[in-house]
């Protein structure tokens, strides 16, 4: 902790300016009034405060606002934002997208994923839902940040906003997040024609259930292998060889390359070998001919 000393009269600070960079740590702590600092936060980022001096300034703001900084201060944090921990940010209430933009710009190129995720979470909470303006801001200033939100937060996205989401914004989304986003996307794109619908829904398909994947297989969509590999394992396993062949179209040959990777590997293990042989790809590992398959999970459910 920074030691308390009294401020020498000649060092008294009446405004936040560049002369402060020559203050030693103790002088800065003793001479800078926290309320003055908060009132003149807009000046701080233009002053090349050292890494160590920023610690002192943060300490002052923490003392002045133990319950969390007001948005008037947060908006002007600049590089001081990079000193914040997720715990600090959790105390904030942020509603302005200008504040979000300013801090996303500052954090670019720095390892701040946990802090940015927490910040976005606070913005969604502050604004009440993940509205179109927020999504537009995230896609513009922080591609991939949408996926930093929890499934609970993503559930507040209205289907009407889904159209603003680009494929690259979903690259880092996990299955639980896509489970939430897929039904919204399905609803948002439901009035589109087959090929247009598939282009739009494709980035969200990691959240699709089996019946929807089966339906796609009837529409000549020629799904690429990358999309197929992102499908939920549970959605792929019930598909027949004929359905997968129809779903992938000319891309079916890619199954050989992915033979050892989930969900292809798991799907192969569930198919009859003679059905797999009809593909002519040399896929191995299916159920040998003449074997009887007992689905014990069904029997257990019935008993």
């Amino acid at each position: 902790d920074v030691e308390r000393t009294t401020c020498p009269p000649e060092k008294e600070v009446h405004e936040i300016d560049e002369s402060l960079i020559f203050y030693k740590k103790r002088e800065l702590e003793a001479c800078v009034d926290a309320a003055l600092l908060a009132a003149q936060m807009d000046r701080v980022d233009a002053i090349p405060f050292t890494y160590e001096q920023l610690d002192v300034l943060k300490h002052k703001l923490d003392e002045l606002y133990p319950q969390g900084y007001p948005e008037s201060v947060i908006r002007h944090l600049g590089h001081l934002f990079l000193k914040m921990s997720p715990e600090d940010i959790r105390k904030w209430n942020v509603t302005s997208l200008e504040t979000l933009k300013a801090l996303l710009k500052v954090s670019k190129g720095h390892e701040m994923s946990a802090q940015v995720a927490t910040l976005i979470d606070r913005v969604v909470v502050g604004r009440g839902q993940l509205d179109k303006d927020t999504v537009d801001t995230l896609t513009a200033f922080c591609p991939g940040c949408l996926c930093s939100l929890s499934p609970e937060r993503l559930s507040s996205v209205p289907p009407s906003v889904i159209g603003a989401v680009r494929p690259q914004d979903l690259d880092t989304c996990g299955p639980r997040q896509l489970d939430v986003l897929y039904p919204k996307a399905r609803l948002a794109f439901q009035n589109m024609s087959g090929s247009e619908y598939f282009v739009k829904i494709r980035p969200f398909l990691g959240g699709a259930p089996t019946e929807d994947v089966k339906a796609l297989s009837q529409q000549n969509v020629s799904m690429d292998l990358a999309t197929f590999m992102k499908l939920r394992r549970e959605a792929v396993l019930p598909l027949t060889v004929a359905e997968v062949q129809k779903l992938l179209g000319p891309h079916v040959e890619g199954l050989k390359v992915e033979e050892q990777h989930s969900p292809v590997r798991d799907w192969i293990l569930k198919q009859r070998q003679d059905d797999l042989d009809t593909l002519g790809l040399g896929l191995q590992g299916g159920i040998p001919n003449g074997y009887l398959i007992l689905d014990l999970s069904v029997r257990e459910a019935l008993s």
Partner: antibody
């Protein structure tokens, strides 16, 4: 990886100006860091001279304030040192360096250095 | 400006020996930085934020300290560690370096 390379005349006459260039690859000089000049005297003493910030603003060592100027050319990704009214005391190896954080703290990347001799 | 004083100015150590050098500041600091310089080369960052190892630096190097007293330790001296070591602060302007500790191999 970030690389810095100093260049400029190795010999300067007293009272003239010393001008050096630092060419940067692997990072943009507008990308949010501080780009510094540091010199090392023949006795190995190191002295920070000044920096130009990502936004083009400067800060200089008070001991050199009236003689030093650091500028940049963002299109070439270069920054420059100009030291006026040199004396033999300015004979040193001059390094350009980028600090390693978002605020002035430590020097993570250094050029290989260029020896400048001030002599008549 | 803050003055950094390194000691000893020159020292020698045998391979495998533990080496400790110190850096004393004229004013209290939160962080200290350490560099290694070999003849004909530019300084290389070893330690940042007092105790964090820079990328690619062997784990035999470590830094510690607080306030006005800091140290750099090499747990087991190796021939390639023969060099001059500098401490540096940027607590306030201007940043300053220590005068260096020259480490020789016995």
């Amino acid at each position: 990886d970030v690389q810095l390379q100093e260049s400029g005349p190795g010999l300067v006459k007293p009272s003239q100006s010393l001008s050096l260039t630092c060419s940067v690859t692997g990072d943009s000089i507008t990308s949010g860091y501080y780009w510094n000049w540091i010199r090392q005297f023949p006795g190995n003493k190191l002295e920070w001279m000044g920096f130009i910030r990502f936004d083009g603003t400067n800060n200089y060592n008070p001991s050199l304030k009236n003689r030093i100027s650091i500028t940049r050319d963002t299109s070439k990704n270069q920054f420059f040192l100009k030291l006026n009214s040199v004396t033999t005391e300015d004979t040193a190896t001059y390094y350009c360096a980028r600090e390693g954080s978002y605020a002035p703290a430590w020097f993570a990347y250094w050029g290989q250095g260029t020896l400048v001799t001030v002599s008549a | 400006q803050i003055v950094l004083t390194q000691s000893p100015a020159i020292m020698s150590a045998s391979p495998g020996e533990k080496v400790t050098m110190t850096c004393s500041a004229s004013s209290s600091l939160s962080y200290m930085y350490w560099y290694q310089q070999k003849p004909g080369s530019s300084p290389r960052l070893l330690i940042y934020d007092t105790s964090n190892l820079a990328s690619g630096v062997p784990v035999r190097f470590s830094g510690s300290g607080s306030g006005t007293s800091y140290s750099l330790t090499i747990s087991r001296m190796e021939a390639e560690d023969a060099a001059t070591y500098y401490c540096q602060q940027w607590s306030s302007y201007p940043p300053t370096f220590g005068g260096g500790t020259k480490l020789e191999i016995k």
